[in-house]
Structures are given as structure tokens and as C-alpha cells.
């Protein structure tokens, strides 16, 4: 789902206040709900009728350093007999998420938010039929 | 997928540098790839064999202010005849994501990262547990 544009409001101080110096803000250390964990049903990526694989990208200057992307294994969906049914489509489910990018020059360290598109898994859909003229 | 714990490394300066004052860091204004957008297949939430609805939560002191949560509509999955197949299970696909929480007292504004669990959509799986005979 879409993250709306920041515009010029969220990270600004109220108009009556002096502007933020040097185009940066104060980010408190520590993460709220850091211990909260995804605990999805087991092995849904292989039990799904639209199964997927995971690829991990790793970047030490990003938080989280590890970003996991799903790729649908099939174009069609898997039927009860374990065969691919090409009358149905496996499609990716995407999500926009934020990560934090670390930038440093010597002892000067700053951080910036970055929007990342993550494919979280796949679902099986009835196709939209494109009639060929 | 899981966001690992920060530990005490990512947001710290190198050991040879003076510590960060007052437990806060410098966050640059602006978001990298802010214009990047999800472009999923149309209406997959209603075309899926494990369809879902969306619920929007809104909080002006959070970025993004709008967080969208999916809820699976059915316990089973929808078959080719549009009927529910109770031999299969609809299950939610979850993702940990970061949001930014704004805290202000008068003209003093600071920000903090928060981890949020988002249900992005649903997928149809072969059951592990046979509750229903």
C-alpha cells in the first residue's frame, strides 16, 4: 500500500517556531515496539497455492540491514493435485516500507529515511481477461 | 518478515568519536525514493481466492499518517465456482515496517522510529491443522 508524500508539513516545526537548522531534525535513539515480531503461519510460502521464494538483500548502512523480497514461483496457481493451473494467476503482494539510511563522514553521522518497495508474498487471483482486438 | 533488533551498533558513532549528545541523532529532512509507488495488479483483494478487506488507521503524529491493514474475509478459500472451499485456509501475510512517531512540546520537536506489524494481504494454503473434518 502507498505511503503518501511527506509534503512540507510532517517534519516541519510549527510556523511560529524558528526553522530547523541545517535541514535536519532530532531523531531519538531507540525504537518503539522493537520487540514486536511477525509470527506468520509456518511455511506459508511453500503451502500457498501461489508459492514464493525469498531473496535476502543485506546492507550494513541500512536499518534494517536485511530486507527480504518474495518472488512468486509460478505464473499460474497450484491446484489440489499439485499441478499448475494456468487459468489462474499468481500475483505479488507489495508494500511500501521505510528504512533508515546511515551516512557518515568521519565522526559526522546522519540518517535519512528511504522508501523501499517490498514484495511480501503472493496470492492467487482470477485473471483479468484482456480480449485481443 | 522480521526486522532484527538494533542492538547497540547501527545508531552509534564509531568508538573513537565523541558520544551522541542527549541520546538523539541527526535525521536529514527528505525521503530517498519518496516518489516510488506500489503498482500491484488491480483489485487483487477481491479477485484473490483468499480475498481481503482493508481497514485504514490514521494518526497525524505518525509518518505515514495512514496505515492500511488487511483482514482476510473467509476462513476457507474461494474456488472456481465462487464457492468457499473449506478444505483450504485463507491466511494473512504480515510484514514488519517502520513508521516515524512525532513528539512535540512547544517548539521542541523530536522524532522516534516505531515498528508496526502490517497485514498486507492474504494467501490460500493447504492446511496443516485439520480442525474441521
Amino acid at each position: 500500500r502507498k505511503i503518501p508524500k511527506v509534503g512540507h508539513t510532517f517534519f516541519q516545526k510549527p510556523e511560529s517556531c524558528p526553522p530547523v537548522p541545517g535541514g535536519s531534525m532530532k531523531l531519538d535513539i531507540g525504537i518503539i515496539n522493537e520487540n514486536q515480531r511477525v509470527s506468520m503461519s509456518r511455511n506459508i510460502e511453500s503451502r500457498s497455492t501461489s508459492p514464493w521464494n525469498y531473496t535476502v538483500t543485506w546492507d550494513p548502512n541500512r536499518y534494517p540491514s536485511e530486507v527480504v523480497q518474495a518472488q512468486c514461483r509460478n505464473l499460474g496457481c497450484i491446484n489440489a493435485q499439485g499441478k499448475e493451473d494456468i487459468s489462474m494467476n499468481s500475483v505479488p503482494i507489495q508494500q511500501e516500507t521505510l528504512v533508515v539510511r546511515r551516512k557518515h563522514q568521519g565522526c559526522s553521522v546522519s540518517f535519512q529515511l528511504e522508501k523501499v518497495l517490498v514484495t511480501v508474498g503472493c496470492t492467487c487471483v482470477t485473471p483479468v481477461i484482456h480480449h485481443v482486438q | 518478515r522480521k526486522i532484527p533488533k538494533v542492538g547497540h551498533t547501527f545508531f552509534q558513532k564509531p568508538e573513537s568519536c565523541p558520544p551522541v549528545p542527549g541520546g538523539s541523532m541527526k535525521l536529514d529532512i527528505g525521503i530517498i525514493n519518496e516518489n516510488q509507488r506500489v503498482s500491484m495488479s488491480r483489485n487483487i483483494e477481491s479477485r484473490s481466492t483468499s480475498p481481503w478487506n482493508y481497514t485504514v488507521t490514521w494518526d497525524p503524529n505518525r509518518y505515514p499518517s495512514e496505515v492500511v491493514q488487511a483482514q482476510c474475509r473467509n476462513l476457507g478459500c474461494i474456488n472456481a465456482q465462487g464457492k468457499e472451499d473449506i478444505s483450504m485456509n485463507s491466511v494473512p501475510i504480515q510484514q514488519e515496517t517502520l513508521v516515524v512517531r512525532r513528539k512535540h512540546q512547544g517548539c521542541s520537536v523530536s522524532f522516534q522510529l516505531e515498528k508496526v506489524l502490517v497485514t498486507v494481504g492474504c494467501t490460500c494454503v493447504t492446511p496443516v491443522i485439520h480442525h474441521v473434518q
Epitope: 503461519s41 506459508i44 | 488507521t57 476462513l75 485456509n89 497485514t119 492446511p127 491443522i129
Partner: nanobody
Framework: QVQLVESGGGLVQVGGSLRLSCEVS????????MGWFRQAPEKEREFVAA????????RYAHFVKGRFTISRDNAKNTVHLQMDSLKPEDTAVYYC????????????????WGQGTQVTVSS
């Protein structure tokens, strides 16, 4: 933290009826389904019935099918279990709980249960 308060249990004769209620608070927005479970003395806790929050889609264990009906009141965040044609083997403590993964939810993954409500069916 999800909070669950079950009520409506009691002592009833064979063939009688009871209506159990479960008041739920603290559920996440994305909550998917609710279930009723039961545990008889010296037995494992078992699934009884489930209902989805949105569609009202329901499922029953084979041993209660046709006798028990699960329903929900979204406005009051309450789930009910109407129990008819009760049998002695229905004697147990009945619990409700969130089913975050629908019918894929494993009972051994629950961190929290309410106090339950005792149902006793006498012959």
C-alpha cells in the same frame, strides 16, 4: 494485550441449551477471526468453532456440528456460542481466543487465555 472475558457457563441437563459470551478488548485492527475452544478434565484443549470478523464465515468441529452456533457482535466486540442439544461429553471449561491466522492458528502458539467458563452437562 488482548483481553478475553468468557461468561454464560453453568449446570444444565442433557438436551438443554446454554449461550456463552466472550467480551474481547485490545484486539489489533487486523484481527481476523475468533474461536471457541474447550478443555475437559484430563484432556487436551480442543477447537470447537471459529468465525471471521468480517464475513461472518464460520466453522465447527465435527463433534458439535449442527448443535452449536457461533456468532459475533462487532459493535460490542463480543463473540457468542449458542449450545443446543447438550451432551455429557460437552462438559468442559470453554475458552474463546483470537485466531490471528484463521484456521491455521495453532493452539500451542497462544501466549494468553482468559479464565474460561465452566459448562457441566448432567444426565
Amino acid at each position: 494485550q488482548v483481553q478475553l472475558v468468557e461468561s454464560g457457563g453453568g449446570l444444565v441437563q442433557v438436551g438443554g441449551s446454554l449461550r456463552l459470551s466472550c467480551e474481547v478488548s485490545g484486539l489489533p485492527v487486523s484481527s481476523y477471526a475468533m474461536g471457541w475452544f474447550r478443555q475437559a478434565p484430563e484432556k487436551e484443549r480442543e477447537f470447537v468453532a471459529a468465525i471471521s470478523w468480517i464475513g461472518g464465515d464460520s466453522r465447527y468441529a465435527h463433534f458439535v456440528k449442527g448443535r452449536f452456533t457461533i456468532s459475533r457482535d462487532n459493535a460490542k466486540n463480543t463473540v457468542h456460542l449458542q449450545m443446543d442439544s447438550l451432551k455429557p461429553e460437552d462438559t468442559a471449561v470453554y475458552y474463546c481466543n483470537d485466531m490471528p491466522y484463521g484456521l491455521d492458528t495453532r493452539m500451542d502458539e497462544y501466549e494468553y487465555w482468559g479464565q474460561g467458563t465452566q459448562v457441566t452437562v448432567s444426565s
